[in-house]
C-alpha cells in the first residue's frame, strides 16, 4: 500500500546520524522537561528529519517509476502539476559539472532546495544506473545532510 516500504535502512540511518537529540534515559528526560526544554526537543528532531526525509522520499519515488501502474499517484499527482516540477525542468538542460558549479556559487542554494536539485541531477546521470548505485551506497553510509555537503564541496571530476 505504501511507498514507504522500500529503502528503509538508508532513511533510518540518516535520521539517526543527523540527530543529536537522543533521550534514552527516562530520568534525563524528566529533568530536561522540568527545565522546559522537552517540547522543543521533539520539534528540533522533526526539523532535522524534514530535509532528509524529503531526499529519501524523492529517491524512493524515482526508484519506483518503473512500476508506474502501482505507484501512479505518488509521483504523478501534485497540486502544482506533475512530479517533474520547476526544479526538474530547470535542471533538464544542465550538465552535471555545470550544475555543481552553479550550486556552489550559491544561486541554487537560494533559488531551489538543495535536496531536490541534487537528487534530480543524480537521477538523470548515467543511463546505465551505475551512478545511481554509487549514490545509494553513499547514502546508506552517510547522513543525507553530510552527503549533500560533501557533494557540493567535491568536484565531480575528482569522484569519477
Amino acid at each position: 500500500r505504501s511507498l514507504q516500504d522500500t529503502e528503509e535502512k538508508s532513511r533510518s540511518f540518516s535520521a539517526s546520524q543527523a540527530d543529536p537529540l537522543s533521550d534514552p534515559d527516562q530520568m534525563n528526560e524528566d529533568k530536561r522537561h522540568s527545565q522546559g526544554t522537552f517540547t522543543s526537543d521533539y520539534s528540533k528532531y522533526l526539523d532535522s528529519r524534514r530535509a532528509q526525509d524529503f531526499v529519501q522520499w524523492l529517491m524512493n519515488t524515482k526508484r519506483n517509476r518503473n512500476n508506474i501502474a502501482k505507484r501512479h499517484d505518488e509521483f504523478e499527482r501534485h497540486a502544482e502539476g506533475t512530479f517533474t516540477s520547476d526544479v526538474s525542468s530547470y535542471l533538464e538542460g544542465q550538465a552535471a559539472k555545470e550544475f555543481i558549479a552553479w550550486l556552489v556559487k550559491g544561486r541554487g542554494r537560494r533559488d531551489f532546495p538543495e535536496e531536490v536539485a541534487i537528487v534530480e541531477e543524480l537521477g538523470r546521470r548515467h543511463a546505465d544506473g551505475s551512478f545511481s548505485d554509487e549514490m545509494n551506497t553513499i547514502l546508506d553510509n552517510l547522513a543525507a545532510r553530510d552527503f549533500i555537503n560533501w557533494l557540493i564541496q567535491t568536484k565531480i571530476t575528482d569522484r569519477k
Epitope: Q4, D5, P113
Partner: antibody, heavy 119, light 112 residues
Framework: QVQLVESGGGVVQPGRSLRLSCAAS????????MHWVRQAPVKGLEWVAF????????YYTDSVKGRFTISRDNSKNTLYLQMNSLTAEDTAIYYC????????????WGQGTLVTVSS | DIVMTQSPDSLAVSLGERATINCKSS????????????LAWYQQKPRQPPNLLIY???IRESGVPDRFSGSGSGTDFTLTISSLQAEDVAFYYC????????FGQGTKLEIK
C-alpha cells in the same frame, strides 16, 4: 501486508499501572519510528509518544511526561507503552502507529486497545 | 503546539455529489525548503483506526481512490470528495506533521 496488533488494555483504577504492547509484522520493524496515538471521546485524536527506529530517541506529549515510557524490542518486533499513575483523563483507545518515511506521518495503524481508568 | 481547526463539524451530502471539508492551522505548515505543506488527511470508519488518505496536502496515498483530493497551502486546506460514495461515510481528520503532531477535531460525513 503490514499488521499492527495492540494488546494489554483493560479497566484499571486511578493511580495504577498498565503496559500496552503492539506486535508488528509485514515490514522491517527495526527500520521505522513508531508512535502511540490515543483517541478519547472528548479529546479526539492525540499523539502520545514516539520512539525512533533504534530506540535512541523518545518523545512524549506533555500530559504523560514522567508517567509513560515508550520502548521497543526489535528482536521481537514489538512496541511497548508502560503507563504509570493513570488518571481518568488517560481513558482512551490507544493505537500504535507506524511512521512513514516522513517524520510524524502515520501510514499504518493498529486496531487499538481500550484503556479505561475508573474507580 | 499547532492547533488544527476543522469545519464543518458534520456534513450531509447526497450520493454522487461533492463533499468539501476545511482545515485551518494556527500557524503555517509550509516548509519553504521544499515548498511542501506538512498536512495530512485521514479517514476513520466506525470501529476502525484512522486510514491515511493524503499527505503533503495534495498527494494521495497508494490505493486511495482518485475522487479524494487535497488542496491548500500555508494555513488553509481542503479535502474534497468529488463524487460521494456510500463507503465514504466516516469521520475525516486533518493532521499537521510539520511540528509535534496535532489533529483537527474531526468532521463527520454522512449521506443526505
Amino acid at each position: 501486508q503490514v499488521q499492527l496488533v495492540e494488546s494489554g488494555g483493560g479497566v484499571v483504577q486511578p493511580g495504577r499501572s498498565l503496559r500496552l504492547s503492539c506486535a508488528a509484522s509485514g515490514f522491517t520493524f527495526s527500520s521505522y519510528g513508531m508512535h502511540w496515538v490515543r483517541q478519547a471521546p472528548v479529546k479526539g485524536l492525540e499523539w502520545v509518544a514516539f520512539i525512533s527506529f533504534d530506540g535512541s530517541n523518545k518523545y512524549y506529549t506533555d500530559s504523560v511526561k514522567g508517567r509513560f515510557t515508550i520502548s521497543r524490542d526489535n528482536s521481537k518486533n514489538t512496541l511497548y507503552l508502560q503507563m504509570n499513575s493513570l488518571t481518568a483523563e488517560d481513558t482512551a483507545i490507544y493505537y500504535c502507529a507506524k511512521e512513514s518515511i516522513l517524520a510524524a506521518l502515520f501510514d499504518y495503524w493498529g486496531q487499538g486497545t481500550l484503556v479505561t481508568v475508573s474507580s | 503546539d499547532i492547533v488544527m481547526t476543522q469545519s464543518p463539524d458534520s456534513l450531509a451530502v447526497s450520493l454522487g455529489e461533492r463533499a468539501t471539508i476545511n482545515c485551518k492551522s494556527s500557524q503555517s505548515v509550509l516548509y519553504s525548503s521544499n515548498n511542501k505543506n506538512y498536512l495530512a488527511w485521514y479517514q476513520q470508519k466506525p470501529r476502525q483506526p484512522p486510514n491515511l488518505l493524503i499527505y503533503w496536502a495534495s498527494i494521495r496515498e497508494s490505493g486511495v481512490p482518485d475522487r479524494f483530493s487535497g488542496s491548500g497551502s500555508g494555513t488553509d486546506f481542503t479535502l474534497t470528495i468529488s463524487s460521494l460514495q456510500a463507503e465514504d461515510v466516516a469521520f475525516y481528520y486533518c493532521q499537521q506533521f510539520y511540528s509535534i503532531p496535532t489533529f483537527g477535531q474531526g468532521t463527520k460525513l454522512e449521506i443526505k
